[in-house]
Interface confidence: low
Amino acid sequence: KIDACKRGDVTVKPSHVILLGSTVNITCSLKPRQGCFHYSRRNKLILYKFDRRINFHHGHSLNSQVTGLPLGTTLFVCKLACINSDEIQICGAEIFVGVAPEQPQNLSCIQKGEQGTVACTWERGRDTHLYTEYTLQLSGPKNLTWQKQCKDIYCDYLDFGINLTPESPESNFTAKVTAVNSLGSSSSLPSTFTFLDIVRPLPPWDIRIKFQKASVSRCTLYWRDEGLVLLNRLRYRPSNSRLWNMVNVTKAKGRHDLLDLKPFTEYEFQISSKLHLYKGSWSDWSESLRAQTPEEEPTGMLDVWYMKRHIDYSRQQISLFWKNLSVSEARGKILHYQVTLQELTGGKAMTQNITGHTSWTTVIPRTGNWAVAVSAANSKGSSLPTRINIMNLCEAGLLAPRQVSANSEGMDNILVTWQPPRKDPSAVQEYVVEWRELHPGGDTQVPLNWLRSRPYNVSALISENIKSYICYEIRVYALSGDQGGCSSILGNSKHKAPLSGPHINAITEEKGSILISWNSIPVQEQMGCLLHYRIYWKERDSNSQPQLCEIPYRVSQNSHPINSLQPRVTYVLWMTALTAAGESSHGNEREFCLQGKAN
């Protein structure tokens, strides 16, 4: 009933709860003396479905047959309409449309852990749209039965609250779930199981790892399990990997030796448990243990390269460079690099530990035969030393690679190509391609990059530390025994016209000609490799085209003579620079008048 229904009643036949597709009869009737005042014949009863008028009738009662009601709840309200007054609500009723429960499917029961309680889940099937009660029944040996009811709207889980024990692990238990509502009932197929079938062990806990004698090769994983566990699965992976290594073990009794871990690597470990070889289910994975394996001494050898610079007649500067070992080669934190410099004939040697750098510079005599050895050390030991004889890398002209070229190859890559040296090409043991940012001052602090190439290769793609709009000095060395030859070229990965022209800083007169001196364009304004400078001049106040002189770019050059100026004529001079992409804007303008005699 919707309200007190003082004025009349609404009755529903056959029931307020009906099966989807059924017809229902709704009757609205007025109680005595509750019609329109003086005009009982004028009573107009109106039936509403929610807010929509579906039927009306003059008199004391109204009958309506309703079909096609949707699943769920529909509200019907009966109202009385009298002349010259608002409609008055008489009474109302809710009709519940639903279906009988379907047979519950896939009933499955589980007990989480040996001390847990039995809980079952099932699939309800389609929604009944009606209040439906589920009863779960469990029967066991010795006619024991347990029952639990569930009155939630969406009930598909029930916990019996009882604990199955392993005293008779092969004893059978049978579970069944029954769904009941006003329109019918249905029971699941029975599910029969034993203790071993349904007990799902708790995940292992208290996971620890021990490295005997701080060695990765003697590693044991420990954990704790419930008492009846027979099988374990272990999975582990480096923390930065997505792929797991899996191991199955039987009767592990809470420990397992791992033999294939990499040194100095953080691993994630998880373990799962099972009570029986083919019955029951695996536990959830344990919480992850993260642990870092100990260091081992480095493997591999450092890639070492060097540069020689003449200081004076008796001394030379040696700069050594080396690349970090890969993580898998370093096998730990590299604490220092050990550099040994030795004069081979006299046997003099000096050793130095370098920390925090991958380069070392020293000054040695120009005489004698010198060799270096470089190794990397972590807490467990050192890598095998890389030994290099210091030689004049460009001394053997016949070993110089020929036709060296450098071309842009996509973003921030340069393709270097060459032809083998004229001397027997089969004598070449390897090529080394070296590159560094071009600095006009020949700055030795500029980082050096290199890569090694096999003797049958005649090209190399350089991409490490290559920036756009920067010019690189590239050298290709051919190495053969204790000899080397080299060729060099300038190259860039991307270029555009320089942002500014050279700044003329002085013009001096020398025997009827002039010498122009300029400052180099700042590296960040060169926008690639410079090919030429141009010097422009024209008579002051003249509208004629300027004359120009084009000079090939050389790193060290910053002056040039011009001898075609007329004496006692004032000229305006300026300079530009060119890359392969075009010419810069003008540098500063300078005026000059040659004082020499006219011819």
């Epitope: 620890r208 490295f211 642990a291 870092q292 100990p294 934190k333 807490s379």
Partner: nanobody, 125 residues
Framework: EVQLVESGGGLVQPGGSLILSCAVS????????IAWFRQTPGHEREGVSS????????YYADSVKGRFSISRDNAKNMVYLQMNSLKPEDTAVYTC??????????????????WGQGTQVTVSS
């Protein structure tokens, strides 16, 4: 032989700070963990914070997160516990403990074979 010696305990007012030090000797590699535990009369030892010497990874119990900070000085073989915003309930004997291996986490006292003698910290107004 592994030895641990704590220092730095004392009386401090609520809201104050204190630094505990643990001098470590006798380990033959960096693969060990130093942990600080505390204990009040009638209660079990509680793991407060730990640090893995090899890489400096740290762990803190929920009760001290954001207030305590653990650090190491490998050159001096020292581990420090900086305790800020101290509360009366932080009053306890603080002891540093050590074990070989790289497992971090709170750990139970029985997992640590090496212990210092302890230092008293009292937080009171």
């Amino acid at each position: 032989e592994v030895q641990l010696v704590e220092s730095g305990g004392g009386l401090v007012q609520p809201g104050g700070s204190l630094i505990l030090s643990c001098a470590v000797s006798g380990f033959t590699s960096d693969y060990y963990v130093i942990a600080w535990f505390r204990q009040t009369p009638g209660h079990e030892r509680e793991g407060v914070s730990s640090i893995r010497i090899g890489d400096g990874a740290t762990y803190y119990a929920d009760s001290v997160k954001g207030r305590f900070s653990i650090s190491r000085d490998n050159a001096k073989n020292m581990v420090y516990l900086q305790m800020n915003s101290l509360k009366p309930e932080d009053t306890a004997v603080y002891t540093c403990a050590a074990r070989y291996d790289t497992l971090l986490g709170g750990g139970r006292p029985r997992e640590f074979p090496y212990w210092g003698q302890g230092t008293q910290v009292t937080v009171s107004s």
